[in-house]
């Protein structure tokens, strides 16, 4: 807390300008009117205040707005945003995407801080859903943003917003998140033709069910091994050797290098060795010839 002292004669600030950088902390406290500061916040960013001086300016705004800053002040916070605590931010009502962008810009170069997470949470809750423009903005600043959301939060993403998602935005998503995003992506891209559709849907396929993979295998998509390795194991297991061969196209040779890793390993164990041999890759571990394959899951369903 800065001590209350009288402003020295002739030092009362009439406007927010460069001369203030020469004020000691106590002079800023005593000589800068909080209301003046609030109306001229747009000037603060052009003045190279020290972080100690910014502490004083924040203190003045906190006194003026104990219930939380108005958006007219928030959008011009600049470096002052770095001084805010999540508790400060919870008092705000941020509705403008421009304000959000301005504050995210200040934090650029840093990981997502608790302050930014709180700001985004307040903003999205205020909007009611994660619309395309917001998602565009958030993923531009934080490519991993989407994968930081819970499946429940992701369920509020409208399919139209999926157009804003880039492949790198999904890099850290787990299967549970892709399970939620895949049906939205399928809906969003449903009117595209085969090859274009595959390019768009590819990053989301970690959430695809077996029947969709079977359908893709009929479309000469040539899925790369990296994508195949991210597919759900339970979705891959029912695929036949012929379907996997069609799905991967020229990339099928890559199965050999991955034969000890999931889902390839588990898929091999489910295939007849005869069928695997037709690939000519030397894949081993399939069901030997003459063995009867019982589908236990089917048996359980009948009993």
């Amino acid at each position: 807390e800065v001590e209350k002292t009288a402003c020295p004669s002739g030092k009362k600030a009439r406007e927010i300008d460069e001369s203030l950088i020469f004020y000691k902390k106590w002079e800023l406290e005593a000589c800068v009117d909080a209301a003046l500061l609030a109306t001229q916040m747009d000037r603060v960013n052009a003045i190279p205040f020290t972080y100690e001086q910014l502490d004083v300016l924040k203190h003045k705004l906190d006194e003026l707005y104990p219930q939380g800053y108005p958006e007219s002040v928030i959008q011009h916070l600049g470096y002052l945003f770095l001084k805010m605590s999540p508790e400060d931010i919870r008092k705000w009502n941020v509705t403008s995407l421009e304000t959000l962008k301005a504050l995210l810009e200040v934090n650029k170069g840093h990981e997502m801080s608790p302050q930014v997470a709180t700001l985004i949470d307040r903003f999205v809750k205020g909007r009611g859903q994660l619309d395309k423009d917001t998602l565009d903005t958030l993923t531009a600043f934080y490519p991993g943003y989407l994968c930081s959301l819970s499946p429940e939060e992701l369920s509020s993403v409208p399919p139209s917003s999926i157009w804003a998602v880039r492949p790198q935005d999904l890099d850290t998503c787990d299967p549970r998140q892709l399970d939620v995003l895949y049906p939205k992506a399928r809906l969003a891209f449903q009117n595209m033709n085969g090859s274009e559709y595959f390019v768009k849907i590819q990053s989301f396929l970690g959430g695809a069910p077996t029947e969709d993979l079977k359908a893709l295998s009929q479309q000469n998509v040539s899925m790369d091994l990296a994508t195949f390795m991210k597919l759900r194991t339970d979705a891959v297991l029912p695929l036949t050797v012929a379907e996997v061969q069609k799905l991967l196209g020229p990339h099928v040779e890559g199965l050999k290098a991955e034969e000890r890793h999931r889902p390839v390993r588990d898929w091999i164990l489910r295939q007849r060795q005869d069928d695997l041999d037709t690939l000519g890759l030397g894949l081993q571990g399939g069901i030997p010839n003459g063995y009867l394959v019982l589908d236990l899951s089917m048996q359980e369903a009948l009993s």
Epitope: I21, F22, N45, P48, T50, Y79, L82, N107, K108, G109
Partner: antibody, heavy 120, light 108 residues
Framework: QVQLVQSGAEVKKPGASVKVSCKAS????????LHWVRQAPGQGLEWMGI????????NYAQKFQGRVTMTRDTSISTAYMELSSLRSEDTAVYYC?????????????WGQGTLVTVSS | DIVLTQSPATLSLSPGERATLSCRAS???????LAWYQQKPGQAPRLLIY???NRATGVPARFSGSGSGTDFTLTISSLEPEDFAVYYC?????????FGQGTKVEIK
């Protein structure tokens, strides 16, 4: 033309103080803040602080707080930078530089530099 | 303090070639408060660019600055013999002002 002329080279012992001067000409001395920047031999530039010649107000880099004093004498359009408790790592060329017309943080006119050598 | 990282440390080029120098800030400079200076051996630095892209008085048009936020670039479109020097970027978004470690442009 606008010029900043600095005092000559100095050799000091560790623990001593040095006072470098910077005489301005060709413009109104009190209208432009002055920065002090130093450069150790073969190294980069390091900002020390800034003085407002109009009222003597200063803003020092935390690193130098307590050791640096910036003053001015408006009657002779001269600014001074005094650094105390010198150590060998203070050996550097010290520059004064005038603030840019539009931006207090950038520097459009520089003095020629003063070499300060700290050696026992 | 805001840290500025310049790259490359040294740039070996021939006269007439284009030079591209990079400066990255550890945090966003909200009003693009970044300057570029040129320094030759035994001389004081000389201001080339301020506010990221504005040329200082008397600076030739072959020098241009660009960038915003955290990434900034100084471009010399066609190197003249007198351009071989060390170049520093400096931020003044927040005091203390800080400088990059410098990029030396040398003759190939």
């Amino acid at each position: 033309q606008v010029q900043l002329v600095q005092s000559g080279a100095e050799v000091k012992k560790p623990g001593a103080s040095v006072k470098v001067s910077c005489k301005a000409s060709g413009y109104t001395f009190t209208s432009y803040a002055l920065h002090w920047v130093r450069q150790a031999p073969g190294q980069g530039l390091e900002w020390m602080g800034i003085i407002n010649p109009q009222n003597g107000g200063t803003n020092y880099a935390q690193k130098f707080q307590g050791r640096v004093t910036m003053t001015r004498d408006t009657s002779i359009s001269t600014a001074y930078m005094e650094l105390s408790s010198l150590r060998s790592e203070d050996t550097a060329v010290y520059y004064c530089a005038r603030k840019h017309k539009y931006r207090i943080g950038s520097m459009d006119v520089w003095g020629q530099g003063t070499l300060v050598t700290v050696s026992s | 303090d805001i840290v500025l990282t310049q790259s490359p440390a040294t740039l070996s080029l021939s006269p007439g070639e284009r030079a591209t120098l990079s400066c990255r800030a550890s945090q966003s400079l909200t009003s693009n408060q970044l300057a570029w200076y040129q320094q030759k051996p035994g001389q004081a630095p000389r201001l080339l660019i301020y506010d990221s892209s504005n040329r200082a008085t008397g600076v030739p048009a072959r020098f241009s600055g660009s960038g915003s936020g955290t990434d900034f670039t100084l471009t010399i479109s066609s190197l003249e013999p007198e351009d071989f020097a060390v170049y520093y970027c400096q931020q003044y978004g927040s005091f203390p002002a800080t400088f990059g470690q410098g990029t030396k442009v040398e003759i190939k």
